[in-house]
């Protein structure tokens, strides 16, 4: 699997999950999240060559099409597969609220 | 929705489904599919600017991050959302078989 265990410990050039830390204030301009100040969001990056972690029947067809037609615009793209939630604290007036923001952290990628 | 109804009738530059016809023999080198000879597979293409058909909480965060950090490698990618099956006929020995190949035709796209 193209997950953090494999990707963070390798020099994989193809589609893989990469490290990305997002600071809510500096990177997004968000002041409303009290805690945490930022988080390891990660992101997906890398080419999707023939047979590389293909998601669907369509992505297999497209990867083979791309292999035979390398100049074509049509090619699979490296995108998140498994996402995890992030617990945050924010304020409603003076009252702190704890919430789980779903699908916030990328754990693995796929070629779609 | 970034579907064939909208995308095929517009000159949309952002993420949208685009027309692509795949000839099984010419484009993939496949002889095993007897019918059809090819099909309208389509594909997804176009940039994913802030707020453009974003898929998850994460893709919203990433699009905003990308807005603030335009030089960054981390950006959402335009990929298939709704896929449809394709009925095919192929032969096992001399016996024709009809099969539905799932997830073969792109009907709409999303920024993931």
């Amino acid at each position: 699997a193209l997950d953090t265990n494999y990707c963070f410990s390798s020099t994989e050039k193809n589609c893989c999950v990469r490290q990305l830390y997002i600071d809510f204030r500096k990177d997004l301009g968000w002041k409303w999240i009290h805690e945490p100040k930022g988080y390891h969001a990660n992101f997906c990056l890398g080419p999707c060559p023939y047979i590389w972690s293909l998601d669907t029947q369509y992505s297999k067809v497209l990867a083979l099409y791309n292999q035979h037609n390398p100049g074509a615009s049509a090619a699979p793209c490296c995108v998140p597969q498994a996402l995890e939630p992030l617990p945050i604290v924010y304020y409603v007036g003076r009252k702190p609220k704890v919430e789980q923001l779903s699908n916030m952290i990328v754990r693995s990628c796929k070629c779609s | 929705a970034l579907d064939t109804n909208y995308c095929f009738s517009s000159t949309e530059k952002n993420c949208c489904v685009r027309q692509l016809y795949i000839d099984f023999r010419k484009d993939l080198g496949w002889k095993w599919i007897h019918e059809p000879k090819g099909y309208h597979a389509n594909f997804c293409l176009g940039p994913c600017p802030y707020i453009w058909s974003l898929d998850t909480q994460y893709s919203k965060v990433l699009a905003l991050y990308n807005q603030h950090n335009p030089g960054a490698s981390a950006a959402p990618c335009c990929v298939p959302q709704a896929l449809e099956p394709l009925p095919i006929v192929y032969y096992v020995g001399r016996k024709p078989k009809v099969e539905q190949l799932s997830n073969m035709i792109v009907r709409s796209c999303k920024c993931s």
């Epitope: 047979i51 293909l54 029947q57 297999k60 083979l64 035979h68 | 023999r25 993939l28 080198g29 496949w30 002889k31 095993w32 192929y90 078989k97 099969e99 190949l101 799932s102």
Partner: nanobody
Framework: EVQVVESGGAAVQPGESLRLSCAAS????????MGWFRQAPGKQREMVAI???????NYADSVKGRFTISRDATKNTVYLQMNSLNPGDTAVYYC????????????WGQGTQVTVSS
Amino acid sequence: EVQVVESGGAAVQPGESLRLSCAASGSIFNTATMGWFRQAPGKQREMVAIITDGGRTNYADSVKGRFTISRDATKNTVYLQMNSLNPGDTAVYYCNALTIVPRSSIYWGQGTQVTVSS
């Protein structure tokens, strides 16, 4: 049970030739796109060549003009003829089969070692 089995790996000297074979189960061979991949020590697995059931081939730039992939439907076998071998070709060579029917899958063999050294 679907099986993909490679053979033909050996130790050779630079400039020599070698032919690898890959036998696949008859149930998948006729519709499969067959491929040879290789993995050198400490490197990622990379595509060497692929061949479709219609005989369409595709090669990695590093092997073009030296390697030839072919298939024999009567024997359910794919071959990789490797000429002008050099030390950079040293790797474990894997055969695979990409199928859409009767099941959408990618089947891999166990690999065969090719060593090119003087």
